[in-house]
């Protein structure tokens, strides 16, 4: 995935969560917290922008409370002491419901947008440059926390079922003599235009000359299988596709196809009956040669959740499973923009799709 210089997201972090904000807060940084308010247990949650992990110095404490009709407290804590509370007596969150919470850091204030509407602005009481950590606690389950630097475009995966909570990246292409070992490395900076998380169709709209459309999804979607959707604009270098789901307990196979007309440009086919992950291309109903090599054991497990992340680069597709780079698949159909359809089928239940 290309983050255009932005920090990679935290995917499905466990709560309570504390994570570093690389480079600290800066004017124009947008941080998106996506999750679901738990319907049981607890009446509060909080998002904190703080210095370090102690919790004694919190520049901005954003604290929805499902008490007394519901309200949101905003405050600052310095050297362990809270300042005067600022309260917003409208509650934009609902218990048991997903939410999309965006924080925009500006020179004079934090602006907070909830579910697409500006909710509150909180004027800085302490210099925001001191903030280097975000923490989340309370009655909430997180899907992701993502970061968008000034003058970049957001890429915001939402894998609520993925069991890891570190920034997830592909290994960079080797530059020069030394090559880092495969694993989790910062992504190559590259331009991303638009991203959509959705249930059935995807084609982000445009409003302004340089749009940055936030990804979208419905709560608890029941994806039809097979699942088919359009990839608006097709593939291009830096284009990412992310999927998450759960393998059925009795699964034999499933597939993820990237299609161009009647051709299958990329066929990703985990086979539990063969303990293999088969990759191939089909042109005019004829399959090419299979690719099966893996750097480690079969990453998909019956009955378990998974995430698949496909990054298109100029010469190949890079595929990561559960946050770890798995293989590269060199393009056999090279007219990337015509590869504009995603098809998923087989023995899985999808939970999120982002194109």
């Amino acid at each position: 995935m290309a983050f255009s210089g932005s920090q990679a997201p935290y995917l499905s972090p466990a709560v309570p969560f504390s994570g570093t904000i690389q480079g600290g807060l800066q004017d124009g940084l947008q941080i998106t917290v996506n999750g679901t308010v738990l319907s049981s247990s607890g009446t509060r949650f909080a998002v904190n922008f703080q210095t370090g992990f102690s919790g004694n110095d919190i520049a901005f404490h954003f604290n929805p409370r499902f008490e007394d009709g519901g309200y949101v407290v905003c405050n600052t804590r310095q050297n362990g002491s809270w300042g005067p509370e600022e309260r917003k007596t409208h509650m934009p969150f609902q218990k048991g419901m997903p939410f999309d919470l965006c924080f925009l850091v500006q020179s004079s204030d934090f602006k907070v947008m909830v579910n697409g509407i500006l909710f509150v602005q909180y004027f800085h009481r302490v210099p925001f440059h001191r903030v280097d950590t975000i923490s989340v606690n309370g009655s909430v389950q997180l899907s992701y926390i993502s970061f968008q630097n000034p003058r970049t475009v957001p890429v915001q995966p939402a894998f609520s079922t993925v069991p890891f909570s570190q920034p997830v990246c592909f290994p960079p292409r080797p530059r020069g003599r030394r090559q880092k070992p495969p694993g989790v490395w910062p992504a190559n900076p590259a331009p991303i235009t638009q991203t959509v998380i959705h249930t059935v169709q995807s084609a982000p709209g445009q409003m302004f000359s340089t749009p940055a459309i936030p990804p979208m999804m419905y709560p608890h979607p029941a994806y039809p299988m097979p699942f088919i959707t359009t990839i608006l604009g097709g593939l291009y270098p830096s284009k990412s596709i992310l999927l998450s789901g759960t393998v059925l307990p009795s699964a034999q196979r499933f597939h993820i196809n990237l299609c161009s007309g009647n051709h299958i440009a990329f066929h990703l086919n985990p086979r539990f009956d063969e303990n293999a992950v088969v990759r191939n291309t089909q042109i005019d109903n004829s399959w090419g040669s299979e690719e099966r090599s893996l750097p480690r054991k079969m990453p998909f497990v019956r009955g378990q959740s998974f995430s698949v992340w496909i990054l298109c680069e100029a010469h190949c597709l890079k595929v990561a499973v559960d946050g770890q780079h798995l293989f590269e698949y060199y393009h056999r159909l090279r007219n990337l923009p015509t590869i504009n359809r995603l098809e998923v089928g087989g023995d899985i239940q999808l939970t999120h799709v982002q194109t």
């Epitope: 124009g28 409208h90 947008m113 509407i117 602005q121 957001p154 709209g205 302004f208 990804p215 419905y218």
Partner: antibody, heavy 127, light 109 residues
């Protein structure tokens, strides 16, 4: 080309129901929030409801709360407004609009606006 | 609810005139204000977003500004096609997250 087309309006008796549809093309209804706005004859614009599909969040004007329900079906790329217990004062042209809210990639600020509107559909509540 | 009080409700002007329309928010709405133009029998069209940003394709004679909770739409030199009704709209979360001003009808003098 982005387009919104409303349908489903018509004449209905007080207490009756109607379901308005807002068919989107050129983008998906899941890529931004969808709002319904109405305009009574000779009057100004009144916001009715919105859905933010990303989180499933919905919100309603006090005047329609409990009577109207907004929803979206991404498989049909369509938003809906189910209107029950209709009253004479609900008579209006109903517009759906796409509301774009995001951080501009060229500046460190958010931008807001209903950038695309449908042509409107007339709902008349009369006995 | 946040009220958007728009004034004047109507005005008469001539081609070439400078026209100013004001909206006052009943409380802070930051810069989450848009302006729309509507002609009879037509849907509204976005002119200004985020209080002061010109929407693409809108002539540069239209401009928006903000001073605290006061928002202004200015047409620097009125053209024949500008005779219409103009609405301001805020989107700052409250019991009603979206409210419109009452509208200003710009008529030919």
């Amino acid at each position: 080309e982005v387009q919104l087309v409303e349908s489903g309006g018509g004449l209905v008796q007080p207490g009756g129901s109607l379901r308005l549809s807002c068919a989107a093309s050129g983008f998906t209804v899941s890529s931004s929030s969808i709002h319904w706005v109405r305009q009574a004859p000779g009057k100004g614009l009144e916001w009715v409801a919105y859905i933010y599909p990303y989180s499933g969040y919905t919100s309603y004007a006090d005047s329609v709360k409990g009577r109207f329900t907004i929803s979206a079906d991404t498989s049909k790329n369509t938003a809906y407004l189910q209107m029950n217990s209709l009253r004479a004062e609900d008579t209006a042209v109903y517009y759906c609009a796409r509301y774009s809210t995001y951080s501009s990639s060229s500046s460190s600020k958010w931008v807001w606006g209903m950038d695309y509107w449908g042509q409107g559909t007339l709902v008349t509540v009369s006995s | 609810d946040i009220q958007m009080t728009q004034s004047p409700s109507s005005l008469s002007a001539s081609v070439g005139d400078r026209v100013t329309i004001t909206c006052r928010a009943s409380q802070s709405v930051s810069s989450a204000v848009a302006w729309y133009q509507q002609k009879p029998g037509k849907a509204p069209k976005l002119l200004i977003y985020s209080a002061s940003s010109l929407y693409s394709g809108v002539p540069s004679r239209f401009s928006g500004s903000r001073s605290g909770t006061d928002f202004t739409l200015t047409i620097s030199s009125l053209q024949p096609e500008d005779f219409a009704t103009y609405y301001c709209q805020q989107s700052y979360y409250d019991s009603n997250p979206i409210t419109f001003g009452q509208g200003t009808k710009v008529e030919i003098k």
